[in-house]
Interface confidence: medium
């Protein structure tokens, strides 16, 4: 349905609060580096116009695209050749190329501070002013994720502003605080990485490739909802997720409002544990739907092989509506199968695909595919076989020990790529330990294959920005259903001409005394990296003893009287050694 | 849930024509993956033609094709058999099934098929 005025119909569709937090977090999203204060003063101006198209729709201006208005205001902005370069350039273009434009220059890795949370003086500004306290909060994440899903932003707002309500109270602030932030801060890197993957996914692959993840993961959640209803779903939740990767927040909000409320209307059809989030207030409803678990498989289901395998029309079927007949092979064995990972579930349809297509051709179709399913059980079988060996490891080291064998494993494998993404990547990579080894067996795979995809998704986003090695960069694009097991199956790379050993990274001074733990580990971390990019052959031994090496010289040197003048005697000393060790 | 109404059944000579209809209430049929059965005295349920839901792919059994054709008509969502050149060995009772949720697939076996009408009665003599 058409209206005069787009900007007016978002603003009373989402009203003003919303529609400012919207507009802020797209801001934020575009120019990264603004201070908060300029972003305040865009967003204002941009509420008044809306508010005069509310009033009267014909009004001068009303008329034009949201793109056009936001890119408008955007292109005001005094210090845009100054501060983001050629994103500048952008403002010489027309709708949609400019927005398109503006798009292109997101930066994944914005060089911003890490944001040290302070319980006093976080206090002091909630209770100056809650709304601007709820505002920044829109304003830093988003500038730090530039493509975290605007309406679930709105939603870890308005938890973060209940947190500060709750402990702003408290005697202890920072006992009350920290660990609920702490908590929130994973939620919201998580949130941040699952709507990276899905843009990444239409960006790169096309809508057809979120489509099919959504058909599995949907049909998993509710498996007593029929195919019709989950391609609705599918379709409807895929509207959602192009706009806001697309930018168009307004529109990505309203619609998944709508989506919410077809969901609630329609649950006796969905799915039976949908009852609590359906009574809850709108962004809660949303984050709740999102989260909902998945609900029991329905009884007497018949078994796969008989559409797919034994019936002597399977080829008619797939020949004559291939997406249609593929996508209902997704439907059926994810709704069989909650304990499989959406990444398997997609291997599983993609090599059933391929296996059609090559019996198909052939003189006798249905002895070439009525084994079909025998052939996918290696699929299953690799992930899971993989899981057991990781968390057996993962047990016997910790979560640390895991982490610096996924550094270990992953410098051989690609050299090239930057420390820094390098150790950013081997972490979370040992935190799918801690997340996941510790679950029951139903829940393992699809916890440990998601989760690899979001961190290996990263890998690609940091990579694609500076690309350095073939091998990384035919992993990330050559299918994305294949990604993880690309890269397990990567080995070392024997053509890396190593690093000249550079005194300079293990120089080490006083600072690092006072760092917290988790610094202290990335320390150490990113000295391991560079070890073995001037080592990539040094066995466990020689590893174990320079590390072992360096953490002893740190501690001495932290010990001492004069720290500064201990690194400055110390530091020489340790390079010498860790040549030895390594000769 | 789906109810299923079979009409059009009869006493018909061989040669001749028959039109079987089948009404659908609690579903679109264009939703539903339906298919028409046959059984006659002391033998099997046995499919006869079956159209998808969502795309217009349709089946038939090799006895019957080329004489019977299957169709659907989504506005007063309702599903037909017409029979042409029938023979004696077309006698039976025959069924409308569906399969809700199923918009594609179109099964032979009628387990498969969770709603059944009450079936109509086609008897081709002389």
């Known amino acids: 349905d058409t209206h005069k005025s787009e900007i007016a119909h978002r603003f009373k569709d989402l009203g003003e609060e919303h529609f400012k937090g919207l507009v802020l977090i797209a801001f934020s999203q575009y120019l990264q580096q603004c201070p908060f204060d300029e972003h305040v003063k865009l967003v204002n101006e941009l509420t008044e116009f809306a508010k005069t198209c509310v009033a009267d729709e014909s009004h001068a201006g009303c008329e034009k695209s949201l793109h056009t208005l936001f890119g408008d205001e955007l292109c005001k902005v005094a210090s845009l050749r100054e501060t983001y370069g050629d994103m500048a350039d952008c403002c010489e273009k027309q709708e949609p190329e400019r927005n398109e434009c503006f798009l292109s220059h997101k930066d994944d890795s914005p060089d911003l501070p890490k944001l040290k949370p302070d319980p006093n003086t976080l206090c002091d500004e909630f209770k100056a002013d809650e709304k601007k306290f709820w505002g920044k909060y829109l304003y830093e994440i988003a500038r730090r994720h530039p493509y975290f899903y605007a309406p679930e932003l709105l939603y870890y707002a308005n938890k973060y502003n209940g947190v500060f309500q709750e402990c702003c109270q408290a005697e202890d602030k920072g006992a009350c605080l920290l660990p609920k932030i702490e908590t929130m801060r994973e939620k919201v890197l998580a949130s941040s990485a699952r709507q990276r993957l899905r843009c990444a996914s239409i960006q790169k692959f096309g809508e057809r490739a979120l489509k099919a993840w959504s058909v599995a993961r949907l049909s998993q959640k509710f498996p007593k909802a029929e195919f019709v209803e989950v391609t609705k779903l599918v379709t409807d939740l895929t509207k959602v997720h192009k706009e806001c990767c697309h930018g168009d927040l307004l529109e990505c909000a309203d619609d998944r409002a709508d989506l919410a409320k077809y969901i609630c209307d329609n649950q006796d059809t969905i799915s039976s544990k949908l009852k609590e989030c359906c009574d809850k207030p709108l962004l809660e409803k949303s984050h709740c739907i999102a989260e909902v678990e998945k609900d029991a498989i329905p009884e007497n289901l018949p078994p796969l092989t008989a559409d797919f395998a034994e019936d002597k029309d399977v080829c008619k079927n797939y020949q004559e509506a291939k997406d249609a007949f593929l996508g209902s092979f997704l439907y059926e064995y994810s709704r069989r199968h909650p304990e499989y990972a959406v990444s398997v579930l997609l291997r599983l349809a993609k090599e059933y695909e391929a296996t059609l297509e090559e019996c198909c051709a052939k003189d006798d179709p249905h002895a070439c595919y009525s084994t079909v399913f025998d052939k996918l059980k290696h699929l299953v079988d690799e992930p899971q076989n993989l899981i057991k060996q990781n968390c057996d490891q993962f047990e016997k080291l910790g979560e640390y020990g895991f982490q610096n064998a996924l550094i270990v494993r992953y410098t051989r494998k690609v050299p090239q790529v930057s420390t820094p993404t390098l150790v950013e990547v081997s972490r979370s990579l040992g935190k799918v330990g801690t997340r996941c080894c510790t679950k029951p067996e139903s829940e393992r795979m699809p916890c440990t294959e998601d989760y690899l995809s979001l961190i290996l998704n990263r890998l690609c986003v940091l990579h694609e920005k500076t690309p350095v090695s073939e091998k990384v960069t035919k992993c990330c694009t050559e299918s994305l259903v294949n990604r993880r097991p690309c890269f397990s199956a990567l080995t070392p790379d024997e053509t890396y001409v190593p690093k000249a050993f550079d005194e300079k990274l293990f120089t080490f001074h006083a600072d690092i005394c006072t760092l917290p733990d988790t610094e202290k580990q990335i320390k150490k971390q990113t000295a391991l990296v560079e070890l073995l990019k001037h080592k990539p052959k040094a066995t466990e031994e020689q590893l174990k003893t320079v590390m072992e090496n360096f953490v002893a010289f740190v501690d001495k040197c932290c010990a001492a009287d004069d720290k500064e003048a201990c690194f400055a005697v110390e530091g020489p000393k340790l390079v010498v050694s860790t040549q030895t060790a390594l000769a | 849930e789906v109810q299923l109404l079979e009409s059009g059944g009869g006493l018909v000579q061989p040669g001749g024509s028959l039109r079987l209809s089948c009404a659908a209430s609690?579903?679109?049929?264009?939703?539903?993956?339906v298919a028409w059965f046959r059984q006659a005295p002391g033998k099997e349920r046995e499919f006869v033609a079956g159209?998808?839901?969502?795309?217009?792919?349709?089946y038939y059994a090799d006895s019957v094709k080329g004489r019977f054709t299957i169709s659907r008509d989504n506005s007063k969502n309702t599903l037909y058999l017409q029979m042409n050149s029938l023979r004696p060995e077309d006698t039976a009772v025959y069924y409308c099934?569906?399969?809700?949720?199923?918009?594609?697939?179109?099964?032979?076996?009628?387990?498969?098929?969770?709603?059944w009408g009450q079936g109509t009665l086609v008897t081709v003599s002389s």
């Open positions: 609690g579903r679109y049929i264009d939703e539903t993956a």
């Open positions: 159209i998808g839901g969502g795309v217009d792919i349709t």
């Open positions: 099934a569906a399969r809700p949720g199923r918009p594609l697939i179109t099964s032979k076996v009628a387990d498969l098929y969770p709603y």
